[in-house]
């Protein structure tokens, strides 16, 4: 058993049929010594008396809010949550496996630049009685500070018969130099509580590996005389690290119709303009990637050909 | 340590091309190592990230773009040193800071060159003959060092009398290649910045 936060405790249980469970001793936070009784949740049934209560925690029915009283007055609470371990593996029932970039990916994180600011998100099908708490640091043995905000519900989607909820959190490394060469990874820890179930999820990464620039901005077309070619130009996204001559991007320019199976013109360039062949009903799209360290491509920025 | 010798160079900033080749060569070599040593811990997640130049050179700090010198986090516990202007030893006005930056890059390359050559000598003794260093990568390191045009004492190649542990050598190769790739990215960014200056 360990303390998650004040008056909230996590009991770690090996979860298998007829498991013996864990013996837990609760102590009432009071100077009083006599006439103390204990109840669980909203029930008025007295579970025991005395300053301490010893219970055998085996299942979710044994978890919940234990309250000690004296003469009708509440003295203190202890909330017990369960953390299940099945076949030596901690449960991951609350969050959905996103399977990208590999199996057992519950947290996904991205950074728009090298400023030390990043966003993580996760998915669940659970809609109520759900809380998240996020902590982060650079390195684990001698951790350096990363400040995370509160996790918020950022999107809701319908997936077949199920509703899927996306939560996200923004974090900022306290003292980040965009030009630094990372040798210690960022660690992100998410505590998830659904009703009386506790789970924790972690992710470890270097900012350089989660970079995904915003799409290029201000796409413009200029038809070339006596030719089917057009010159397309664009600018670096505002959110990208500066100076741009140090933090350079490379670009992919594509002309394609509405369907992905249609024919296309595609060219890669380090410049902020390119010449392509435009077709009727097609659109020109441009995306960006760090020129020197190949992490993710940005989303496409698009303009119609006509 | 000698200051750079001015060697006028027409056309493109001479070191940019070499630094691009360097990044390409080390990335290819790292990819090859990851494929060949698939049953060794050789991915970024599996290895310890060590920097053999730590406390010996200060490339990131010495080559910091002017715009980032206002960032306190980039200047923590170090002298304020940054690039002002210039091209790869091609200008007589090459500043002292510029020289410091380029000489730091040169020292990085020299240290990695010695490590890689020592390692390759060990790998050539491996009866499995599983992996060797790409001669192209070693050649590209040499070309960039020559383009940087510094005179510096040669570091003797480390020789070891004991029987090499090939497993450890291969893991060290992975660690070295990951670190060198990160440094090659920094070098490429620096050269691109100088080219634009």
């Amino acid at each position: 058993i360990w303390e998650l936060k004040k008056d909230v405790y996590v009991v770690e249980l090996d979860w298998y049929p007829d498991a013996p469970g864990e013996m837990v001793v609760l102590t009432c936070d009071t100077p009083e010594e006599d006439g103390i009784t204990w109840t669980l949740d909203q029930s008025s049934e007295v579970l025991g008396s005395g300053k301490t209560l010893t219970i055998q925690v085996k299942e979710f029915g044994d978890a919940g809010q234990y309250t000690c009283h004296k003469g009708g007055e509440v003295l203190s609470h202890s909330l017990l949550l369960l953390h299940k371990k099945e076949d030596g593996i901690w449960s991951t029932d609350i969050l959905k496996d996103q399977k990208e970039p590999k199996n057992k990916t519950f947290l996904r994180c991205e950074a728009k630049n090298y400023s030390g600011r990043f966003t993580c998100w996760w998915l669940t099908t659970i809609s109520t009685d759900l809380t998240f708490s996020v902590k982060s640091s650079r390195g684990s043995s001698d951790p350096q500070g990363v400040t995370c905000g509160a996790a918020t519900l950022s999107a809701e989607r319908v997936r077949g018969d199920n509703k899927e909820y996306e939560y996200s959190v923004e974090c900022q490394e306290d003292s980040a130099c965009p030009a630094a060469e990372e040798s210690l990874p960022i660690e992100v820890m998410v505590d998830a509580v659904h009703k009386l179930k506790y789970e924790n999820y972690t992710s470890s990464f270097f900012i350089r590996d989660i970079i995904k620039p915003d799409p290029p901005k201000n796409l413009q077309l200029k038809p070339l005389k006596n030719s089917r070619q057009v010159e397309v130009s664009w600018e670096y996204p505002d959110t990208w690290s500066t100076p741009h001559s140090y933090f350079s991007l490379t670009f992919c320019v594509q002309v394609q119709g509405k369907s992905k199976r249609e024919k296309k013109d595609r060219v890669f360039t380090d410049k902020t303009s390119a010449t392509v062949i435009c077709r009727k009903n097609a659109s020109i799209s441009v995306r960006a990637q760090d020129r020197y360290y190949s992490s993710s491509w940005s989303e496409w920025a698009s303009v119609p050909c006509s | 340590r000698n200051l750079p010798v001015a060697t006028p160079d027409p056309g493109m900033f001479p070191c940019l091309h070499h630094s691009q080749n360097l990044l390409r060569a080390v990335s290819n070599m790292l990819q090859k190592a990851r494929q060949t040593l698939e049953f060794y811990p050789c991915t970024s997640e599996e290895i310890d990230h060590e920097d053999i130049t730590k406390d010996k050179t200060s490339t990131v700090e010495a080559c910091l773009p002017l715009e980032l010198t206002k960032n306190e986090s980039c200047l923590n516990s170090r002298e304020t040193s940054f690039i002002t202007n210039g091209s790869c030893l091609a200008s007589r006005k090459t500043s002292f800071m510029m020289a410091l930056c380029l000489s730091s890059i040169y020292e990085d390359l020299k240290m990695y060159q010695v490590e890689f050559k020592t390692m390759n000598a060990k790998l050539l003794m491996d009866p499995k003959r599983q992996i060797f260093l790409d001669q192209n990568m070693l050649a590209v390191i040499d070309e960039l060092m020559q383009a940087l045009n510094f005179n510096s004492e040669t570091v003797p190649q480390k020789s070891s009398l004991e029987e090499p542990d090939f497993y450890k050598t291969k893991i060290k190769l992975c660690i070295l290649l990951h670190a060198f790739r990160i440094r090659a990215v920094t070098i490429d960014r620096v050269m691109s910045y100088l080219n634009a200056s």
């Epitope: 024919k263 595609r266 890669f268 | -």
Partner: antibody, heavy 118, light 107 residues
Framework: QVQLVQSGAEVKKPGSSVKVSCKAS????????LHWSRQAPGQGLEWMGW????????EYAPKFQGRVTITADESTSTAYMELSSLRSEDTAVYYC???????????WGQGTLVTVSS | DIVMTQSPLSLPVTPGEPASISCRAS??????LHWYQQKPGQQPRLLIA???QSISGVPSRFSGSGSGTDFTLTISSLQPEDFATYYC?????????FGQGTKVEIK
């Protein structure tokens, strides 16, 4: 299985024209760009131009501009390359090639030898 | 026009040994570079697209690298069927241009 089948070898006199055909099978004809390139005996490849069979748009290499015409007939899934004012240096194997990507070629025809000789 | 220069023009290799072919562009072409193989009396065959993207059906011993002006096609271990002429082609701008070819011959 996508295939491009070209017409047979031709012998032409200097100053005349030649029209080589390229019939496509497998896949929808207008879903691909079609290119023509040539290869003189013992020499490298030289790109001549492309056509978009969907709308008839064409683009030619400046070297061949005014002398080459590329056309396409969607009803027969056939593309044609006509080269006029032939000279002896036009002796080459002419290839058609296609791709959904405009700028490179993933399927090639077997080639047509055009010999220009007086 | 962008001029593509291949080297060497002839490359004698022992079967089972690796081979590398270089292709240089007269100006920067990013990764807009493709590789083809051509055997005598046959049409060219696409091997690599955009400098390093493998093509389905092409053996994994063929790999490409490079960007900007310098590119390399590598064959990790030459098989008897790999003896052929190899061409690079730039797609950065029209007109599309090819290298002059590298003939890989049995040593």
């Amino acid at each position: 299985q996508v295939q491009l089948v070209q017409s047979g070898a031709e012998v032409k006199k200097p100053g005349s024209s030649v029209k080589v055909s390229c019939k496509a099978s497998g896949g929808t004809f207008s879903d691909y760009y079609l290119h023509w390139s040539r290869q003189a005996p013992g020499q490298g490849l030289e790109w001549m131009g492309w056509i978009d069979p969907e709308n008839g748009d064409t683009e030619y290499a400046p070297k061949f501009q005014g002398r080459v015409t590329i056309t396409a007939d969607e009803s027969t899934s056939t593309a044609y390359m006509e080269l006029s004012s032939l000279r002896s240096e036009d002796t080459a194997v002419y290839y058609c090639a296609r791709n959904k990507e405009l700028r490179y070629f993933d399927v090639w025809g077997q080639g047509t030898l055009v010999t220009v000789s007086s | 026009d962008i001029v593509m220069t291949q080297s060497p023009l002839s490359l004698p290799v022992t079967p089972g040994e690796p081979a590398s072919i270089s292709c240089r562009a007269s100006q920067s072409i990013s990764i807009n570079l493709h590789w083809y193989q051509q055997k005598p009396g046959q049409q060219p065959r696409l091997l690599i697209a955009f400098a390093s993207q493998s093509i389905s059906g092409v053996p994994s011993r063929f790999s490409g690298s490079g960007s900007g002006t310098d590119f390399t096609l590598t064959i990790s271990s030459l098989q008897p069927e790999d003896f052929a002429t190899y061409y690079c082609q730039q797609s950065n701008s029209f007109p599309l241009t090819f290298g002059q070819g590298t003939k890989v011959e049995i040593k």
